[in-house]
């Protein structure tokens, strides 16, 4: 059974993948952005159910096509390069999802922008950490 | 003195149109780029619009768009809002405001006097 | 859409006496360049907005010192150290990290 130490570390590092989403988030959906247009025509695909850790197993394995699309942001909107600013998710994702267990992600019929995919695995973390609290 | 004016407000019957303009003066217009923020009577903000300092990005709120277009004439200091489709819930004073997020992004740190746009039959 | 709320929705003030406007944002407004877009407006009766602050606590040019910023992520905070008759009216809070959208605005008065 998870402990209270255990259950706070998972809230802590559901947090902190939050707010990196939310930063990519704010970084990609914004007029000021110059490359929004061509960023929105990138697709990406949506999990088919999201509801538990084991399920972040989708999420990493759209980690390697975020960071393509991040790559062609100006250098000045992101003050981290994309490709730390993905290693320090993946590090977060793999520590949550926990490679125990192997999961075979199943994703829905519909491709989504980037926005959209963003969206989602932010409201799946407020989700998870809304149990938690 | 940096300024910014609208004109073109008036009132209109729903479904008809109406053009906004938004006269810059002070500065130099083509490094700005420029939004459309609304206010209904006696409620808050709301942002209509922005265009790109060069023309080459324009976005939309998602109550105007496919209605409202927005659009500028660097050579003129002119900022536009071509608004079809009117409804009466586009009643407002519209306000154009300027931003330049390349060099120091203040926010919208000038804004013009509005223009009031009501919508009736 | 980022949803910004501000509390209280009016606040009345003694002359001279400090006032304190909060405002929350749904979602961090944390840019990926670092920056964190959050702008105070202030409108007085029958006038457009004008600019206060900019990036939570930058007071634009010719802003008295009397109006401060603070905060962090999601919760902001715009403080008016000593309230002069001049600071009647309503102050809104901005958020320009994604496409701009405002709180609802506070009303400032005199009691």
């Known amino acids: 059974a998870p402990t209270s130490s255990s259950t706070k570390k998972t809230q802590l590092q559901l947090e902190h993948l939050l707010l990196d989403l939310q930063m990519i988030l704010n970084g990609i959906n914004n007029y000021k952005n110059p490359k929004l247009t061509r960023m929105l025509t990138f697709k990406f695909y949506m999990p088919k159910k999201a509801t538990e850790l084991k399920h972040l197993q989708c999420l990493e394995e759209e980690l390697k096509p975020l960071e393509e699309v991040l790559n062609l942001a100006q250098s000045k909107n992101f003050h981290l390069r994309p490709r730390d600013l993905i290693s320090n998710i993946n590090v977060i994702v793999l520590e949550l999802k926990g490679s125990e267990t192997t999961f075979m992600c199943e994703y829905a019929d519909e491709t989504a922008t980037i926005v959209e995919f963003l969206n989602r695995w932010i409201t799946f973390c407020q989700s998870i950490i809304s149990t938690l609290t | 003195q940096v300024q910014l004016v609208e004109s073109g407000g008036g009132v209109v019957q729903p479904g008809r149109s109406l053009r906004l303009s938004c006269a810059a003066s002070g500065f130099t217009f083509s490094s700005y780029g420029m939004h459309w923020v609304r206010q209904a009577p006696g409620k808050g903000l709301e942002w209509v619009a922005v265009?790109?300092?060069?023309?080459?990005?324009?976005y939309y709120a998602d109550s105007v768009k496919g209605r409202f277009t927005i659009s500028r004439d660097n050579s003129k200091n002119t900022l536009y809002l071509q608004m079809n489709s009117l409804r009466a819930e586009d009643t407002a004073v519209y306000y154009c405001a300027r931003e330049e997020w390349e060099l120091e992004d203040y926010g919208m740190d000038v804004w013009g006097q509005g223009t009031t746009v009501t919508v009736s039959s | 859409d980022i949803v910004m709320t501000q509390t209280p929705l009016s606040s009345p003030v003694t002359l001279g006496q400090p006032a304190s406007i909060s405002c929350r944002s749904s979602?961090?407004?944390?840019?990926?360049?670092?920056?964190?877009?959050l702008s105070w407006l202030q409108q007085r009766p029958g006038q457009p907005p004008r600019l206060l602050l900019y990036?939570?606590?930058n007071r634009f040019s010719g802003v008295p010192d009397r109006f401060s910023g603070s905060g962090a992520g999601t919760d902001f905070t715009l403080k008016i150290s000593r309230v002069e008759a001049e600071d009647v009216g309503v102050y809104y809070c901005?958020?320009?990290?994604?496409?701009?959208?405002f709180g609802g605005g506070t009303k400032v008065e005199i009691k």
């Open positions: 979602h961090s407004l944390v840019h990926s360049d670092g920056h964190t877009y």
């Open positions: 990036k939570i606590s």
């Open positions: 901005m958020q320009t990290t994604q496409f701009p959208t």
């Open positions: 265009i790109w300092y060069d023309g080459s990005n324009k």
